[in-house]
Interface confidence: low
């Protein structure tokens, strides 16, 4: 029986009975938060062979091995992962070994085995036989290997039964428990699975099979399962489903997701039966099972029951995520907040149409309205008293409405009102009148020319750049000397710069009045020598990266209407030079014949330019005789077992420090102080652990159902 769409077993160990008839779990399996130690020996689920998503074990008291529970679990597909992991074993206080002796393949994702105080037999498993890449595995804070004394079957009787492989230059026997070897297929099978008798399975099999070279005898399928056969692709009129099987249209039409309402079933798109149309696509009609591309962002209509939606925090904005049409009125009242501009853009940036009015008042945290970056139509079907459909009052730091060079906004009905916005230039408001088609609708008092823009540099002159020079991590720029009518009114220049992969940034991107700003800022004084142009050296930049740069003159000059006169440049885009790339990642090599090596790697994390080729060098190494001399059975004295506490400590040094030549004299050496890089790595590691643990807790601790 196929079970799913995800099984969560918690609190009561008897819930395990739900797994009784499962051969495949289509989804995830959680076993967690069973605080009372139980006897699990009577629970055994030999039918379970495949989990299509991930397996998560967390705080299950009394469980000592998974081998008895899931003796035939062969494949974890990792179609969906838990924080990048397909197997998570976390804080399992009594687990002594993993014991999944039939686990042959984790198709996608890594493993995370952490804080299991009594867990051994970790170094005896060769995960590279199960996973494609082991570099992302995280196995930390378990019982120290020295205290485990892991012995594979037959080792003590000098009749070792298991095969050997090399991990981290250590050639050793591979097993899951004291009596279960890790199964390996003959090299003649290559990437194929094999039977218990080491006969090669059909290429479409994954994990194992009951008969050789037979696509109907697979335990699991490499690609897709259909009508008892493993197939490389789904046959005509069938569709991929949950990453592992083929289903027909009727089946897809009859599925109902946990998230969607009953009226909205699954869809068929690009040969797959899926819960929702993918990003950029929309259903071809409300009852349709098919997707068509959206023109622009996909439409999503949101409605406010109370007609007016107040946005006074990031939380209230969150409700509008993904909305493109808002039926109702928007009242924006953001007095404070952290990183507010980018948060608001994240949640409100797709809104294109507001059917009622938009009112922005007391929003002292806003510098710009550019977070409504797709707003193109205010219908004004409902208006404020006085027939206003766009109302902007008392926003102490509002400097920009939108970038009118790249913005079309229409206000279909109603007037605009602006008052007490001291940093908003009247010219900006007049520009909005022209763009939105409201010119002539406003009466004299609707746009107050004295209290809008009274504290802003409104009449801006243009600063021109005169030269730019780049290296791999530096940019030098200079610009014309700017002389306001009274040179004493020039305080300084401010240079703004930031990474800009695309030439589409504006001055107000990511900027709010609470200190958040996506731009880096540097102050530059005017050189006293009149012949020298002001300039700056920007250093510590990334190689082969495009930056956006602009300069503002900070002045005190007043012009007519007591408005401040200022100057600023256009935004300049400039790319640093290329540099040497960082090292290629995840280098793996394996031999597939007596005269060939296959080497695989991933691109460097920092290409620092356009990569055009790789250089591969190799050299012959002498055979290491040590591998043959060392007797792995004669364990050096195994230390007295100390119960590990499951925390992650630096291993204690039990031997005397080695005597080496240090600083020209013989004597015991102290450990070298950690380098900055090592300290940073440790800090990042601790941070990463914390992030994962938070993710785990947030994912699994849920309120009890009412």
């Amino acid at each position: 029986e196929i079970c799913g769409p995800g099984i969560d077993i918690r609190n009561d160990y008897q819930q395990l009975k739900r797994l009784e008839n499962c051969t495949v779990i289509e989804g995830y399996l959680h076993i967690l938060l069973i605080s009372k130690a139980e006897d699990y020996r009577s629970y055994r689920f030999p039918k379970l062979t495949v989990i299509t998503e991930y397996l998560l074990l967390f705080r299950v008291a009394g469980l000592e091995s998974l081998g008895d529970l899931f003796p035939n679990l062969t494949v974890i597909r990792g179609w969906k992962l838990f924080y990048n992991y397909a197997l998570v074993i976390f804080e399992m206080t009594n687990l002594k070994d993993i014991g999944l002796y039939n686990l042959r393949n984790i198709t996608r994702g890594a493993i995370r085995i952490e804080k299991n105080a009594d867990l051994c037999y970790l170094s005896t498993v060769d995960w590279s036989l199960i996973l494609d890449a082991v570099s992302n595995n995280y196995i930390v804070g378990n019982k120290p290997p020295k205290e485990c004394g892991d012995l594979c079957p037959g080792t003590m009787e000098e009749k070792p039964m298991c095969e050997k492989t090399t991990i981290n230059n250590e050639y050793n026997y591979r097993c899951w428990t004291t009596n279960r070897c890790q199964k390996m297929c003959p090299s003649t099978c290559g990437k194929r699975a094999c039977t218990e008798n080491n006969e090669c399975c059909h290429p479409e099999c994954l994990g194992s099979c009951s008969a050789p070279d037979n696509d109907t005898a697979c335990v699991a399928c490499r690609h897709y399962y259909y009508a008892g056969v493993c197939v490389p692709a789904c046959p005509p009129n069938t569709y991929r489903f949950e990453g592992w099987r083929c289903v027909d249209r009727d089946f897809c039409a009859n599925i109902l997701s946990a998230e969607s309402s009953d009226s909205e079933g699954f869809v068929i798109h690009d040969g797959e039966c899926m819960q929702e149309c993918p990003s950029g696509f929309i259903r071809n009609g409300s009852q349709s099972m098919y997707c068509i591309p959206c023109e622009g962002p996909c439409p999503k209509v949101c409605e406010e029951e109370k007609k007016t939606k107040t946005i006074d925090s990031v939380t209230s904005a969150q409700m509008l995520q993904g909305c493109t049409i808002f039926k109702g009125n928007l009242l924006i009242n953001i007095r404070r907040g952290n990183n507010i501009a980018s948060e608001l853009e994240n949640f409100m940036g797709l809104i294109e149409v507001v059917t009622g009015y938009v009112k922005i008042r007391h929003s002292h945290a806003l510098v710009s309205l550019s977070f409504l970056k797709n707003l193109r139509l205010i219908l004004g079907e409902e208006q404020l008293e006085g027939n206003y459909s766009f109302y902007v009052l008392d926003n102490q730091n509002l400097q920009q409405l939108w970038d009118w060079d790249h913005r079309n906004l229409t206000i279909k009905a109603g007037k605009m009102y602006f008052a007490f916005n001291p940093k908003l230039c009247v010219s900006e408001i007049y520009r909005m009148e022209e763009v939105t088609g409201t010119k002539g609708r406003q009466s004299k008092g609707d746009i107050n020319t004295r209290n809008n823009g009274e504290r802003a540099s409104c009449e801006s002159d243009v600063l021109h750049f005169t030269s730019t020079t780049t290296s791999k991590n530096r940019i030098i720029i200079t610009w014309h000397r700017y002389r306001p009518p009274d040179y004493r009114d020039l305080i300084s220049f401010t240079v703004y710069y930031k990474e800009a992969p695309f030439k589409n940034v504006t001055e107000y991107d990511g900027q709010d009045a609470c200190g958040s700003n996506s731009w880096n800022m540097v102050d530059v004084d005017l050189p006293p020598n009149k012949d020298v142009e002001p300039g700056i050296l920007l250093h510590g930049l990334k190689p082969w990266t495009q930056y956006a740069v602009y300069v503002k003159a900070v002045t005190l000059t007043m012009v007519e209407n007591d408005h401040i006169r200022g100057a600023k440049s256009e935004i300049l885009y400039i790319r640093t030079n290329a540099s040497v790339p960082s090292i290629p990642l995840d280098v793996l090599s394996a031999s597939n014949s007596s005269s060939q090596l296959i080497v695989k790697w991933n691109p460097p994390s920092l290409p620092n330019g356009n990569l055009s080729y790789y250089i591969v060098r190799w050299q012959r190494q002498p055979q290491d005789g040590y591998l043959y001399r060392h007797n792995y059975c004669s364990k050096d004295k195994i230390p007295i077992r100390k119960y590990a506490d499951g925390t992650i400590d630096i291993e204690e040094v039990t031997e005397n420090p080695k005597t080496e030549v240090c600083g020209g004299e013989k004597g015991p050496c102290c450990a070298c102080p950690k380098t900055e890089a090592e300290k940073q790595a440790e800090k990042e590691e601790a941070e990463y652990r914390k992030v994962f643990e938070n993710f785990l807790h947030n994912s699994i601790f849920v309120p009890r159902p009412e």
């Epitope: 289509e26 008892g228 089946f251 599925i255």
Partner: antibody, heavy 123, light 112 residues
Framework: QAQLQQPGAVLVRPGASVKLSCKAS????????MNWVKRRPGQGLQWIGL????????RLDQNFKDKATLTVDKFSSTAYMQLNSPTSEDSAVYYC????????????????WGAGTTVTVSS | DVLMTQTPLSLPVSLGDQASISCRSS???????????LEWYLQKPGQSPKLLIY???NRFSGVPDRFSGSGSGTDFTLKISRVEAEDLGVYYC?????????FGGGTKLEIK
């Protein structure tokens, strides 16, 4: 359009087992449970049991555990129900009907029905 | 076994009237996954049953919106807002939450 074809009528002697067939077409046979439902003249519907064509997993109403045996032939996409030792009590219309694999949040209902086979037990 | 009791056994109505059929289960029919698999079927003379409502209140595709289902726990109702001639036949409720699955005894909708 998915269809289930059943023979119209079967006459059977008391005590002589009979095997009713239900041939599926125009859908993936192994993706749905096959259910059998009984309707006696002048009475209501009664669920007999179901079988999963992919692995022949069966669930029967205990009242029918000795009376009905459910089997499938994957290759011909046909489900069978054998009525053992029939008596006059077994004279009824027997319907086969499919339902979606039953788990999670899947919709669960009989969406396609056969026309029914009228079984008459008579000597 | 879950016993499903339908009332009334027979329901005479005039065309255009509202009809209401009740179905009561002997125990709660909430499945362990949280869903209530309660369905309504209509069987017309000489035909196979046809699905009307699934999971208490969801209309199957092609079923007119004059049919509606409601209820929870152990009490469920099928309503037909304006009865038409094509609605006549025997209505069955059915629970698919607990094996063995069981039908109600049926309600015959007929013309007054």
């Amino acid at each position: 359009q998915a269809q289930l074809q059943q023979p119209g009528a079967v006459l059977v002697r008391p005590g002589a087992s009979v095997k009713l067939s239900c041939k599926a077409s125009s859908y993936s046979f192994t993706d749905y449970w096959m259910n059998w439902v009984k309707r006696r003249p002048g009475q209501g519907l009664q669920w007999i049991g179901l079988i999963h064509p992919s692995d022949s997993e069966t669930r029967l109403d205990q009242n029918f555990k000795d009376k009905a045996t459910l089997t499938v032939d994957k290759f011909s996409s046909t489900a069978y129900m054998q009525l053992n030792s029939p008596t006059s009590e077994d004279s009824a219309v027997y319907y086969c009907t499919r339902s979606v694999i039953y788990y999670g949040n899947y919709r669960w209902y009989f969406d396609v029905w056969g026309a029914g086979t009228t079984v008459t037990v008579s000597s | 076994d879950v016993l499903m009791t339908q009332t009334p056994l027979s329901l005479p109505v005039s065309l255009g009237d509202q009809a209401s059929i009740s179905c009561r289960s002997s125990q709660t029919i909430i499945h362990s996954n949280g869903n209530t698999y309660l369905e309504w079927y209509l069987q017309k003379p000489g035909q196979s049953p046809k699905l009307l409502i699934y999971k208490v209140s969801n209309r199957f595709s092609g079923v007119p919106d004059r049919f509606s289902g409601s209820g929870s726990g152990t009490d469920f109702t099928l309503k037909i807002s304006r009865v038409e001639a094509e609605d006549l036949g025997v209505y069955y409720c059915f629970q698919g939450s607990h094996v063995p699955y069981t039908f109600g005894g049926g309600t015959k909708l007929e013309i007054k």
